[in-house]
Each structure stands twice: as C-alpha cells, then as structure tokens.
C-alpha cells in the first residue's frame, strides 16, 4: 500500500565499473519523485539524490569509503509537490536494492595498453594503471592499489600475419614476452580477478600493433 497514484520503484540495479557506481531503477516518474538511501549492513541510512525525477543515483562517494563493505540501497517514492505525504502505513513507499559489495562486484573497466618496447627478441608491454575514485590520504588510488595481487592482466599477442592468440599473464602491469625477430605483433590485454566467481574479466583493450606510434623498436 502507499499514497494514491504513487508507485514503488522496481528493477533496482547496480551499475558499477572501476568503482564508479550508479543505482538505476524503474519506472520513469509520472507525478512522483524519488529519494535514495544507502547503508552498510550495520550502518545508518544516508539519503542521496533528494526528490529527484531521475531514475538513477550516483552512489560512488558512499561506496568508495569502504569498497569491501556490503551495501544496501532503497528508493523511496513520493507524490510530486507533496513530498511530506506518506503511505497508509505512515511512511512512503520504498523498494530495496540487491546487496552490493564493490570489491567483489564492480566491473573491471576496459584496460589500455600504455606502451610497448621491443629489444631484440623481447617485447615489454605496459598496461596503464587506471585511476579509480577510491581515495586514501586524499589521493585517488589506482586499480592496482585497490586490488593488489588479486588483479592480473592477460595479454593476447599474435603475429600480424597469423590468427592464433598466444597468452601471457602478470600480476604487475608489465609483460616481458619472447617474439620472433623480424615479425610484427599485435597486442590486446584483459583485466582479470581470478578469485571472483562473477565479473571476473574486463572487456579487451583496444588492439595495438607494432609499427604503430605507441611502440618503440630497438635492434640489439
């Protein structure tokens, strides 16, 4: 039950990539507005996105306080222009979100190959260490800072003239691979958190190939 003409939010969904975290829901409001509250399992509710006509709310600032905590959000529905009005039970209609643990569930963003350098038959490939919105001592942490050795990168590399993708793995942001002399190679990387059971992989980075600007070649 609830106030006449007010409908409860539904399909509450967390959308999160590299800890940038937005709660989305339905329906688009007709003569109603929403307010979101978020809390840890043991904490107090904090209100966000007051009386909004949006169907999303950016909760990044809250979840980055402790990305290993489990969060719950709820979306309250109020009649437009009468936000003090409550339902028949004495409080506004609301719907709970699924629980969300950022460290375990945030999607890994698409990585970027920062550079590659060939020295003889070795190539060093470096992955950009992307900055997140997680803060410590007033500085933003990188993905590596947050995940540490839980985060690995898989490198796919192949001769420009062939289709078979060899792989290499690292728990740093650098690869050192063997290549055949005189051959051009292409590279793509994928971020992986093997200890997860879902959302383990990122999408692949854009492909970078030798003979393009990003790389450097040195004959030894």
């Amino acid at each position: 039950s609830g106030t006449t003409n007010t409908v409860a939010a539904y399909n509450l969904t967390w959308k999160s990539t590299n800890f940038k975290t937005i709660l989305e829901w339905e329906p688009k409001p007709v003569n109603q507005v929403y307010t979101v509250q978020i809390s840890t399992k043991s904490g107090d509710w904090k209100s966000k996105c007051f009386y909004t006509t949006d169907t999303e709310c950016d909760l990044t600032d809250e979840i980055v306080k402790d990305v290993k905590q489990t969060y719950l959000a709820r979306v309250f529905s109020y009649p437009a222009g009468n936000v003090e009005s409550t339902g028949s039970a004495g409080e506004p209609l609301y719907e709970n979100s699924p629980e969300f643990t950022p460290y375990l569930e945030t999607n890994l963003g698409q990585p970027t190959i920062q550079s590659f350098e060939q020295v003889g038959t070795k190539v060093n490939v470096t992955v950009e260490d992307e900055r997140t919105l997680v803060r410590r001592n007033n500085t933003f942490l990188s993905l590596r800072d947050v995940f540490g050795k839980d985060l690995i990168y898989t490198l796919y590399y192949w001769k420009s003239s062939s289709s078979g993708k060899k792989t290499a793995k690292t728990n740093t942001n650098e690869f050192l691979i063997d290549v055949d002399k005189g051959e051009n190679y292409c590279f793509s990387v994928q971020a992986v958190i093997p200890s997860r059971t879902v959302n383990r992989k990122s999408t692949d980075s854009p492909v970078e190939c030798m003979g393009q600007e990003k790389g450097e070649f040195r004959e030894i």
Partner: antibody, heavy 120, light 107 residues
Framework: EVQLVESGGGLVQPGGSLRLSCAAS????????IHWVRQAPGKGLEWVGY????????YYADSVKGRFTISADTSRNTAYLQMNSLRAEDTAVYYC?????????????WGQGTLVTVSS | DIQMTQSPSSLSASVGDRVTITCRAS??????VAWYQQKPGKAPKLLIY???FLYSGVPSRFSGSRSGTDFTLTISSLQPEDFATYYC?????????FGQGTKVEIK
C-alpha cells in the same frame, strides 16, 4: 557444482568430420577459458587448443592447426571442437577442461572425455 | 615450444613407499607447473598447482617442489588409491605442454 560434459564422439572415416560439444554447468564459460586436450589409446596427454569465449580468441597445437576449430556459444554455455580432415592419428579420447586463468592455477576441472575413432 | 621431460616413465612401488617423480622444463617456466593424477578410463585430476601448492581436497601426502627448471612430485607414503599415471604440465607460455607421464604400478 562445476561440471563439464563432452559429447559427439564416435567412429569416423579418414578425411571425415566430427563436432564435439563441451557443455558447462556451475559456472559461466565467458568468465573462464576452455581448453581441449586429447589422449591417444595408451599414450599421454596432448594439448589441442583453447578458446576465450568472451572474445573468441583461439590458439591451436601445430598438429591440428588448419583442420580443427574451437568455438563457443555463450548463450548455451557450451564450447565446441570442430574436427575436419580427420586422420588415423587423431584417434583419441578428447577432454575439455576449464582454465581458472590465474598465474597459479590452470586446468582445474575436466570433463569425462569422449572417444573419437578415425578408421576405415 | 617448451618441452617438459618427465622421468621415470614408470615405476614399481609398494604401499607405504616414498615416491618421487621429476619433470624438467626446457626453459624457465617460473612456478607455472601443475601435476595431475589420472586413473584408467578417467579424466586427469589436479593435484598440485604453482609447483608446490596442494589443490583443494588433495591428501597432504602429495607435495611438489621446484629447483630452477626442475620440478618434483613426491608421495610421502604411497596408498593403494595412488596407483595411477601422473603428468606434469607447464602453463607459463602458449602452448601449454605436458610431460610424457609416469605410471606408478604395484610392486
């Protein structure tokens, strides 16, 4: 419970084709990598190839390159091994296995295998 | 491709014996070596990963070690259910490669 079940094996003539399936349950294949490994009667294990179902990337052993193709249907949570131009030396039990994908752990779960016999 | 040379190809032992199987990689593979146990008509089972770590549910009589490019699987006290074939595998580079296998038989 993680499970891999191979099917599609059987008797085929030299030069013929066969498609093996590897149906996965208890995990989502696009979050992992799937390998095919074979074992000729009385012989050791031979790696055939892998697929990353999330992007379709593959790599094959030299012995099967150009004849075998690995694919995946993520909606069915199933990987496939298409074998063409089969030879007597391809006779083996074919296993699919899940690659955990960490630096430390590779093939952590295997299917029960399916026998492929190439003979006239 | 990296070769994994496994020895011996077979051995006979009695229940309670200490058994050692070795694998030598043709080049550096760091610790990216696994050991598998296979019984007749069955799929291989992971025993040891990352050269020396015991996989979940595997009895503690199994252990693995590394010295450079040499890798060892040890069964401290052979049990009746341990009679099987054992394989090493490197997954440091593509393609991954297996050793030839060691058949552990009853003396």
């Amino acid at each position: 419970e993680v499970q891999l079940v191979e099917s599609g094996g059987g008797l085929v003539q030299p030069g013929g084709s066969l498609r093996l399936s590897c149906a996965a349950s208890g995990f989502t294949i696009s979050d992992y990598w799937i390998h095919w490994v074979r074992q000729a009667p009385g012989k050791g294990l031979e790696w055939v190839g892998y697929i990353d179902p999330s992007n379709g990337y593959t790599y094959y052993a030299d012995s099967v390159k150009g004849r075998f193709t690995i694919s995946a249907d993520t909606s069915r949570n199933t990987a496939y091994l298409q074998m063409n131009s089969l030879r007597a030396e391809d006779t083996a039990v074919y296993y699919c296995a899940r690659d955990y994908g960490s630096l430390e752990v590779s093939l952590d779960y295997w299917g029960q295998g399916t026998l492929v016999t190439v003979s006239s | 491709d990296i070769q994994m040379t496994q020895s011996p190809s077979s051995l006979s032992a009695s229940v309670g014996d200490r058994v050692t199987i070795t694998c030598r990689a043709s080049q550096d593979v760091n610790t990216a070596v696994a050991w598998y146990q296979q019984k007749p008509g069955k799929a291989p089972k992971l025993l040891i990963y990352s050269a020396s770590f015991l996989y979940s549910g595997v009895p503690s009589r199994f252990s693995g070690s590394r010295s450079g490019t040499d890798f060892t699987l040890t069964i401290s006290s052979l049990q009746p259910e341990d009679f099987a074939t054992y394989y090493c595998q490197q997954h440091y580079t593509t393609p991954p490669t297996f050793g030839q296998g060691t058949k552990v038989e009853i003396k």
